[in-house]
């Protein structure tokens, strides 16, 4: 019997300082470019080696970005989201959602990483 895959969703505020070559990550998503089924949110698709985000270390590929400097990213066209990041200034505050995959064992058994016991 196979284990069930669950997800642990957490949110975090990440403050980045724009580096010499910018923030150092790519995004996908938007109302006109849904990358995740039934979700027009903005997701991190790539983190540039040695860029500002990589050096900070907290932002991960696959993270959903909920807001930039307090501005909600819901229902934005992809290019509008890109422009928002490019014009966000030197100090950029990101509200992000991390989605961590958790593998549970078969029913009636404890999976690896089960905090109980």
């Amino acid at each position: 019997m196979n284990g069930r895959v669950d997800y642990l969703v957490t949110e975090e505020e990440i403050n980045l300082t724009r580096g010499p070559s910018g923030l150092g990550f790519n995004i996908v998503g938007g109302t006109d470019q849904q990358y995740v089924s039934n979700d027009s949110g903005i997701y991190v698709s790539r983190i540039k080696e040695n860029g500002a985000a990589a050096l900070d270390g907290r932002l991960q590929e696959g993270d959903k970005i909920l807001s930039v400097n307090g501005q909600d990213l819901k229902n934005l066209l992809h290019q509008d989201a890109v422009d928002l990041f490019r014009n966000a200034g030197y100090a950029v505050s990101l509200r992000v959602q991390h989605r961590l995959q958790v593998q549970n064992g078969p029913i009636g058994h404890r999976g690896e990483g089960d905090p109980s016991g």
Epitope: S21, V44, K48, R86
Partner: nanobody, 127 residues
Framework: EVQLVESGGGLVQAGGSLRLSCAAS????????MGWFHQAPGKEREFVAE????????GYSDSVKGRFTISRDNAKNTVYLQMNSLKLEDTAVYYC?????????????????????WGQGTQVTVS
């Protein structure tokens, strides 16, 4: 994973034109930023132009602005580089490149580190 195949290179006289094409595999082509780089003999690979997934945003190196035009046809999974007013110094191998998503940084700083997938290149010689 994306495979890229360039075509359209060749020998052309100074002042002439060429159009390079880059055919890409993959189902989500419109989610990829596409770029062109060139590499002259004995030199590093340098950014030429890039285009966003929807085609609405483009960027060019100063050396080709006003002469080269990048475009894409997402229905055909193809990106193009129209090269006009070619100069001797445009002689190089031209590489197509792709990266998932749109960079949140302007195209002023593009380097090979900004792209993950590369074609084999096509030779352009201006005489």
């Amino acid at each position: 994973e994306v495979q890229l195949v360039e075509s359209g290179g060749g020998l052309v006289q100074a002042g002439g034109s060429l159009r390079l094409s880059c055919a890409a595999s993959g189902r989500t082509f419109s989610s990829y930023t596409m770029g062109w780089f060139h590499q002259a003999p004995g030199k590093e690979r340098e950014f030429v132009a890039e285009i966003s997934g929807t085609g609405g945003n483009t960027g060019y190196s100063d050396s080709v602005k006003g002469r080269f035009t990048i475009s894409r046809d997402n229905a055909k999974n193809t990106v193009y580089l129209q090269m006009n007013s070619l100069k001797l110094e445009d002689t190089a191998v031209y590489y197509c490149a792709a990266v998932l998503g749109s960079p949140t940084d302007s195209s002023d700083y593009r380097s090979t580190l900004d792209y993950d997938y590369w074609g084999q290149g096509t030779q352009v010689t201006v005489s």
